[in-house]
């Protein structure tokens, strides 16, 4: 059993048929020593009394809020979580599994720069009862300060019958060094909780490579005297490090007609303009990469040809 | 020329030549190696390889003020990875194919250390890797890490020589 | 075509020193490892050690440690294997082999006979 | 040390019989085992690398499998120019170690 906060704690349990559980003590938080007698949640059934109850934790029923009294009075309240490990694996019900970029991906993370600020979010189906608490350092043995936010609640898709939710938080390195080369990584930890079900969930991961510009900003197509060709132009995105002759981009652009089985025609630059051919009702997207890291590609940014 | 005296490099040489680094050590990883590389290894098993860090120089504001700090650094880390591409864990079993880029890469990083430190001219000891003989059976995870963390670097070193290129060239 | 020439065929007398060589061509010599292999008469193949011709790292069988000595010279792809304190009982094949996964190259053997 | 242990130390074969020689390792190998054959008066030549995997110019009929500690050489039709001896080698951490070999006779 841990302390998670200020009177709630976790008791991790081995869940399998029949297994024995944890004995726990829970101590009243009081200088009274008589006439002391303890509740669990709603119930007025009294489980024990005296200044400490000894109880074994093996399902969620055991699970709650424990109150100690004296004479009607509440004189201190202990949260007992459940912390589920199955097959030596402790359990992930709470949040969906992303599948993407492996299996067992619950937290997705990235920066749209070297700053030190980045996005993480998780999608789950549980619309009630929930709770997140996220904290995040850089290396875990010396841990450097990271500061996040609090978890919000940022979508709701309908996915078949079920309705799934994406929570997000934003996190800044306290003293973040964009032009370094990083040694150690940023660790992100959120602690879900469930109605009584606590699971925690980590993730591990490089600035560098969870980096994904902003899709280049101020597209703008202009024809050449008596030709098909455009020179296509854009900027880099005002989200993005500076100054750009250090923090430098790499651009991909597509010319793609009407329908997807239509051949694409792409171009890689490093400028941030280019001469393309310009089809009947085709468009052309621009999107960008740092230019020597190969983390995410943007989004595209489009305009149509005509 | 980086010269130990303080004149300034070839900017534009070296930007190129730090850019076909970055684009080798992308397409050299991961390595086709005889078997997948299952197993994900402990932090031990690379040598301690030098990092470009926050109080190096690096950064636009430090090339500005100057530059030797900077390149002085890149120049160990660029002989660090060269002798680590040399090492048995790349030379050795499981053998890399013959058209593997690592050959190329290996040239190139000896070739950017030569453009910021010609003959003859010395700076200060080297960081130089403490290279025991790698077990085969470790080296597909050696050269995984190893491929990794030289990305990182030479992309930072790329950074630098772009925009030294860019505001620093005479 | 890789090619390794080993050194000819040796008579020493015991208690002295010999030094065998293995001339590489047809590959960039610096690229691979030179492993050195013993093989008695009518025996099994026993592994010496190795040398890193890039680095002049060596990595010996602990048996050959103070027996062996892995030389190599870039300038002319030539390996090399000194045997010291010489017995009977190191009278054998000696052969040279680049890495044991690319093609399976070895030399064609030089026969050491240690007697008096 | 790996001790390599190979058997049966002598196969007498019939032409065009399909043959199998073992090869177990005392500790877990991975994959990291190589087939070698030896001719009298000849060099080794490497027939099979990591268990399974076929080397250009050494013919179909030589194949290799298993993992962890244990190894089969298979020569699916005998021929008689394939006579010698067979050594496994392991290749998976130092000291490298051969087994003693098993030698291959046609009847």
């Known amino acids: 059993i841990w302390e998670l906060k200020k009177d709630v704690y976790v008791v991790e349990l081995d869940w399998y048929p029949d297994a024995p559980g944890e004995m726990v003590v829970l101590t009243c938080d009081t200088p009274e020593e008589d006439g002391i007698t303890w509740t669990l949640d709603q119930s007025s059934e009294v489980l024990g009394s005296g200044k400490t109850l000894t109880i074994q934790v093996k399902e969620f029923g055991d699970a709650g809020q424990y109150t100690c009294h004296k004479g009607g009075e509440v004189l201190s309240h202990s949260l007992l979580l459940l912390h589920k490990k199955e097959d030596g694996i402790w359990s992930t019900d709470i949040l969906k599994d992303q599948k993407e970029p492996k299996n067992k991906t619950f937290l997705r993370c990235e920066a749209k720069n070297y700053s030190g600020r980045f996005t993480c979010w998780w999608l789950t189906t549980i619309s009630t009862d929930l709770t997140f608490s996220v904290k995040s350092s850089r290396g875990s043995s010396d841990p450097q300060g990271v500061t996040c936010g609090a978890a919000t609640l940022s979508a709701e898709r309908v996915r078949g019958d079920n309705k799934e939710y994406e929570y997000s938080v934003e996190c800044q390195e306290d003293s973040a060094c964009p032009a370094a080369e990083e040694s150690l990584p940023i660790e992100v930890m959120v602690d879900a909780v469930h109605k009584l079900k606590y699971e925690n969930y980590t993730s591990s991961f490089f600035i560098r490579d969870i980096i994904k510009p902003d899709p280049p900003k101020n597209l703008q197509l202009k024809p050449l005297k008596n030709s098909r060709q455009v020179e296509v132009s854009w900027e880099y995105p005002d989200t993005w490090s500076t100054p750009h002759s250090y923090f430098s981009l790499t651009f991909c652009v597509q010319v793609q007609g009407k329908s997807k089985r239509e051949k694409k025609d792409r171009v890689f630059t490093d400028k941030t303009s280019a001469t393309v051919i310009c089809r009947k009702n085709a468009s052309i997207s621009v999107r960008a990469q740092d230019r020597y890291y190969s983390s995410s590609w943007s989004e595209w940014a489009s305009v149509p040809c005509s | 020329r980086a010269v130990p005296g303080g004149s300034s490099p070839a900017w534009t040489q070296c930007q190129q030549l730090s850019q076909k680094l970055c684009t080798l050590a992308w397409s050299a990883h991961p390595l086709v190696g005889h078997m997948d590389l299952r197993e994900e290894g402990d932090e031990e098993t690379t040598n301690d390889v030098p990092h470009i860090q926050c109080g190096d120089g690096c950064d636009p504001q430090g090339l500005r003020d100057n530059s030797q700090f900077c390149l002085q650094r890149i120049h160990q880390g660029l002989i660090f990875y060269e002798k680590l591409l040399g090492s048995d864990i790349f030379t050795g079993e499981p053998s890399l194919l013959p058209d593997s880029p690592v050959g190329q890469l290996h040239a190139s990083l000896l070739g950017l250390s030569q453009l910021l430190q010609p003959e003859g001219h010395h700076w200060e000891t080297q960081q130089i890797p403490s290279l025991s003989p790698s077990q085969p059976w470790q080296r597909l995870l050696l050269r995984f890490k190893i491929l990794r963390s030289l990305q990182a670097f030479v992309a930072v070193a790329a950074r630098v020589f772009a925009h030294g290129a860019a505001t620093l060239s005479p | 075509e890789v090619q390794l020439q080993q050194s000819g065929p040796e008579l020493v007398k015991p208690g002295a020193s010999v030094k065998m060589s293995c001339k590489a061509s047809?590959?960039?010599?610096?690229?691979?490892?030179m492993h050195w292999v013993k093989q008695k008469p009518g025996q099994g193949l026993e592994w010496i050690g190795y040398i890193n011709p890039y680095n002049d790292g060596t990595n010996y069988n602990e048996k050959f440690k103070g027996k062996a000595t892995l030389t190599s010279d870039k300038s002319s792809s030539t390996a090399y294997m000194e045997l010291s304190s010489l017995t009977s009982e190191d009278s054998a094949v000696y052969y040279c082999?680049?890495?044991?996964?690319?093609?399976?190259?070895w030399g064609q053997g030089t026969t050491l006979t240690v007697s008096s | 040390d790996i001790v390599m242990t190979q058997s049966p130390a002598t196969l007498s074969v019939t032409p065009g019989d399909r043959v199998s020689l073992s090869c177990r390792a005392s500790q877990s190998i991975s994959d990291y085992l190589h087939w070698y054959q030896q001719k009298s008066h000849e060099s080794p030549r490497l027939l099979i690398k990591y268990a399974s995997q076929s080397i250009s110019g050494i013919p179909s009929r030589f194949s290799g499998s298993g993992s962890g500690s244990d190894f089969t050489l298979s020569i699916n039709s005998v021929e008689p120019e394939d006579v010698g001896v067979y050594y496994c080698q392991n290749g998976h951490s130092f000291p490298f170690t051969f087994g003693s070999g098993t030698k291959l006779e046609i009847k």
């Open positions: 047809g590959y960039t010599f610096t690229r691979y490892l």
């Open positions: 082999a680049r890495n044991w996964d690319v093609g399976g190259y």
